[in-house]
């Protein structure tokens, strides 16, 4: 806390300018009033202040609007935002894409800070969905963060959002963010053709069922290796070879080099040799010929 | 008068950690950010990390990110860099700097400590 | 991030003379750029802030100017101690960039 004293003479400060810089901590909280500051906020981000002074100023600020301050005042925060805890920016309310966008500016390519992700959640919770401009915004500034939401929050992304997201948004999903978001790439996507939609959806493939690779099978898409590391084992196991060969066209010489991993190795052990040998890439640890395959889920199932 | 001294270097094996300290004085260091910045034989000066007065926020060159942690204990006036998983490219001499606001420049540097991280 | 480029990277010159170095930010930062001087073997000094304010205690023969983009270092009349190498660095954001340095050597 720093102690009421009162302003020497003359040094009342009349606006918010570079003089200030030459006060101490003490001068500057009881030379400058607050309401002055509120108003002329967006003049202390051209101001050399230190972090002490800066301290001042928050203090100040805080006196003024206990419960939180208004939007015209956080739109100029700059970065003095950061100075600002997550309690602080829970008693904001924000509602002005232009806002946030303005606080997020501040941090820019650096990790998404607790300040960040506070006001991120608030401002999020008080739209009531994530539309598609708020996606638009957050992913330009921070890449991941819709693998950063659980499932729950990402099921409240309407469909019509999934169009803001790009292919490098999705690098650290997981399997269960991805089958939240499959769903609604399928439908946001499905009055593409063949091709656009296969480059749109591609991102989203983690998330897709087998009745989905199996259709995607049947339209010549070559789907790259990588993509296919990322489907999800339980979609690959029930797919035939003829339908992998399909599903990645001239990609398929690429299932060699990762025959030891996942979904490929436990897809292998689900296949006949002699269908693995019709590949002509040597994947070895079929079922082998002669041998009986009983489907014991589907005897589960019927009894 | 303001002092930075550092210290903690030597020479370590990659994959290996090392921890930097820099110990302060002469300033009211709890009102300060520190910065490491650290120059490679023969080149020019590379910015690593930046930590506010009340530690708050730190910020890293990408060249560092989820490696290098910085941080500070302003009970003892001393700067801290932790170093992981070191690479051959991180041999160089780091020094702390000081600066006293966002839009402030580094204006009290100490000598530097050596890392040299070689097999 | 903001990327510094200094020029030349090697100057050669005499005692007396006037020297310029340039630097220029890939993005504007206002005025936000220092100076330093590095000697060998030692930490280096600050020379200039915000583009052209002195430090206290560096020689005025030290200038600096610009703003945006384009800075320059000045040395007007260059004396014995002042062979050493230089560097700018943006601080208008908070990943402090330096340029690659400029090296002043005797002609």
């Known amino acids: 806390e720093v102690e009421k004293t009162a302003c020497p003479s003359g040094k009342k400060a009349r606006e918010i300018d570079e003089s200030l810089i030459f006060y101490k901590k003490w001068e500057l909280e009881a030379c400058v009033d607050a309401a002055l500051l509120a108003t002329q906020m967006d003049r202390v981000n051209a101001i050399p202040f230190t972090y002490e002074q800066l301290d001042v100023l928050k203090h100040k600020l805080d006196e003024l609007y206990p419960q939180g301050y208004p939007e015209s005042v956080i739109q100029h925060l700059g970065y003095l935002f950061l100075k600002m805890s997550p309690e602080d920016i829970r008693k904001w309310n924000v509602t002005s894409l232009e806002t946030l966008k303005a606080l997020l500016e501040v941090n820019k390519g650096h990790e998404m800070s607790p300040q960040v992700a506070t006001l991120i959640d608030r401002f999020v919770k008080g739209r009531g969905q994530l539309d598609k401009d708020t996606l638009d915004t957050l992913t330009a500034f921070y890449p991941g963060y819709l693998c950063s939401l659980s499932p729950e929050e990402l099921s409240s992304v309407p469909p019509s959002s999934i169009w803001a997201v790009r292919p490098q948004d999705l690098d650290t999903c997981d399997p269960r963010q991805l089958d939240v978001l499959y769903p609604k790439a399928r439908l946001a996507f499905q009055n593409m053709n063949g091709s656009e939609y296969f480059v749109k959806i591609q991102s989203f493939l983690g998330g897709a069922p087998t009745e989905d690779l199996k259709a995607l099978s049947q339209q010549n898409v070559s789907m790259d290796l990588a993509t296919f590391m990322k489907l999800r084992t339980d979609a690959v196991l029930p797919l035939t070879v003829a339908e992998v060969q399909k599903l990645l066209g001239p990609h398929v010489e690429g299932l060699k080099a990762e025959e030891r991993h996942r979904p490929v190795r436990d897809w292998i052990l689900r296949q006949r040799q002699d269908d693995l040998d019709t590949l002509g890439l040597g994947l070895q640890g079929g079922i082998p010929n002669g041998y009986l395959v009983l489907d014991l889920s589907m005897q589960e199932a019927l009894s | 008068q303001v002092q930075l001294v550092e210290s903690g270097g030597g020479v370590v094996q990659p994959g290996r950690s090392l921890r930097l300290s820099c110990a302060a004085s002469?300033?009211?260091?709890?009102?300060?950010?520190m910065n490491w910045v650290r120059q490679a034989p023969g080149k020019g000066l590379e910015w690593v990390a930046v930590?506010?007065?009340?530690?708050?926020?730190?910020y890293y060159a990408d060249s560092v990110k989820g490696r290098f942690t910085i941080s500070r204990d302003n009970s003892k006036n001393t700067l801290y860099l932790q170093m992981n998983s070191l690479r051959a490219e991180d041999t160089a001499v780091y020094y702390c700097a000081r600066d006293r606001g966002p839009l402030w420049p580094l204006d009290y540097w100490g000598q530097g400590t050596l890392v040299t991280v070689s097999s | 991030d903001i990327q510094m480029t200094q020029s030349p990277s090697t100057l050669s010159a005499s005692v007396g003379d006037r020297v310029t170095i340039t630097c220029r930010a890939s993005?504007?930062?206002?005025?936000?750029l220092a100076w330093y001087q590095q000697k060998p073997g030692k930490a280096p000094k600050l020379l200039i802030y915000?583009?052209?304010s002195l430090e206290s205690g560096v020689p005025s023969r030290f200038s600096g100017s610009g703003s945006g983009t384009e800075f320059t270092l000045t040395i007007s009349n260059l004396q014995p101690d002042d062979f050493a190498t230089f560097y700018c660095?943006?601080?208008?954001?908070?990943?402090?960039?330096f340029g690659q340095g400029t090296k002043v050597e005797i002609k």
């Open positions: 002469g300033f009211t260091f709890s009102s300060d950010a």
């Open positions: 660095q943006q601080y208008n954001s908070y990943s402090r960039t």
């Open positions: 993005q504007s930062i206002s005025r936000w």
């Open positions: 915000k583009a052209s």
């Open positions: 930590i506010w007065n009340d530690a708050s926020n730190k």
